[in-house]
């Protein structure tokens, strides 16, 4: 091997990747908020809805201070992969009532996939463990009724909104540690 020639800089570095992840998360949060509002207008929710297959919220305001980079990124990636699966399921099995929201759900899925790719690149560049912790994947069957799919959509969008909200806070806090 010859003398070191040096390499041109690639398009980004881990800190830029983290900045990009924050921007993508904020953008996705705004999209989710808007879509959830549309859902409430079209199909008013009677109280809070939940779905057993959704991940439990990872963080609360009180635990933000003790966040560690590997834990946050791994958990965020696992949770977002679950929400991606649920959005794909909604688009596939949501039924005629949700067809009117198809363009918005498609855009949401594309943004989710983009954020997941950015997080993966960040974890690769930092050389953090990427394997998702083993957890049972609950199979998503077809909704029991049209109202069932609407309730599921409310639950998915509500959960994603909360997850993205803590993600923005967590990622901004982690920026100071990288």
């Amino acid at each position: 091997p010859g003398p070191p020639a040096g390499s041109p800089r690639v398009s980004s570095d881990p800190r830029a990747d983290l900045d990009s992840a924050v921007l993508l998360t904020r953008s996705l949060l705004a999209d989710t908020r808007q879509l959830a509002a549309q859902m409430r207008d079209k199909f008013p929710a009677d109280g809070d809805h939940s779905l057993d297959s959704l991940p439990t919220l990872a963080m609360s305001a009180g635990t933000l201070g003790s966040l560690q980079l590997p834990g946050v990124l791994t958990r965020l990636r696992v949770d977002l992969m679950s929400y991606l699966r649920h959005v794909q399921w909604l688009r596939r099995a949501g039924g005629p009532s949700l067809k009117t929201l198809e363009p918005e759900l498609g855009a949401l899925q594309a943004r989710l996939e983009r954020l997941l790719r950015r997080l993966q690149l960040l974890m690769s560049r930092l050389a953090l463990p990427q394997a998702a912790p083993d957890q049972p994947v609950i199979p998503l069957g077809p909704p029991a009724s049209a109202w069932g799919s609407i309730r599921a959509a409310h639950a998915i969008l509500g959960g994603l909104h909360l997850t993205l909200d803590w993600a923005v806070r967590g990622l901004l806090l982690l920026k100071t540690r990288l």
């Epitope: 040096g6 690639v10 590997p70 790719r117 993966q120 560049r125 930092l126 050389a127 990427q130």
Partner: antibody, heavy 114, light 111 residues
């Protein structure tokens, strides 16, 4: 411009030890995970080991586990590979690489032979 | 034997388009991990050509493009040039290794 400069290679007898170093410059070393990747003469690339940006995670290929140790000193912008119990099949050019890997050094040749 | 499978050789004439495939498994490409491609010119160190399936680092011509589907990926080189003659490697993170795995490499010959 990013530079990764490996050193410490050479000829060593089977069972012997070597310590490779990689001096990094031109980027924020402490923000990047670092790898060692090797290439035997006329063969393809084989990943050897990785260490996370802060040194808290270290992983090894099965072929070197228990014999090689990766470490880093972020204050010196330097990556290390301690190689013990060397075998003939460890003969290769050893590259230091950063990121996915995004950046590669020019490599240092390690020859294990009696 | 490499964890990612590539054809050992590929060839094309100047101006042609060539494609190099890379097949993985459920612990790497199939697990959703991104694929990266490297070019190694004779006697030199590998150079990152494509990262995250289809993104080009600055300075890499747009003649090079990547794609990924399921457990496989491919690198396409259009408008082939003599200076593209090199070894090309794919790589992806692997869950079972906790590190990247490389393909066996494809030697590209420009006829």
């Amino acid at each position: 411009e990013v530079q990764l400069l490996e050193s410490g290679g050479g000829l060593v007898q089977p069972g012997g030890s070597l310590r490779l170093s990689c001096a990094a410059s031109g980027f924020t070393f402490s923000s990047w995970g670092m790898h060692w990747v090797r290439q035997a003469p006329g063969k393809g690339l084989e990943w050897v080991s990785v260490i996370s940006y802060d040194g808290s995670y270290k992983y090894y290929a099965d072929s070197v586990k228990g014999r090689f140790t990766i470490s880093r000193d972020n204050s010196k912008n330097t990556l290390y590979l301690q190689m013990n119990s060397l075998r003939a099949e460890d003969t290769a050019v050893y590259y230091c690489a950063a990121g996915v890997p995004d950046y590669w050094g020019q490599g240092t040749l390690v020859t294990v032979s009696s | 034997q490499s964890v990612l499978t590539q054809p050992p050789s590929a060839s094309g004439t100047p101006g042609q388009r060539v494609t190099i495939s890379c097949t993985g498994s459920s612990s790497n490409i199939g697990a959703g991990y991104d694929v990266h491609w490297y070019q190694q010119l004779p006697g030199t160190a590998p150079k990152l050509l494509i990262y995250s399936n289809n993104e080009r680092p600055s300075g890499v011509p747009d003649r090079f493009s990547g794609s990924k589907s399921g457990t496989s990926a491919s690198l396409a080189i259009s408008g082939l040039r003599s200076e593209d003659e090199a070894d090309y490697y794919c790589a992806a993170w692997d869950d079972s290794l906790n590190g990247p795995v490389f393909g066996g490499g494809t030697k590209l010959t420009v006829l």
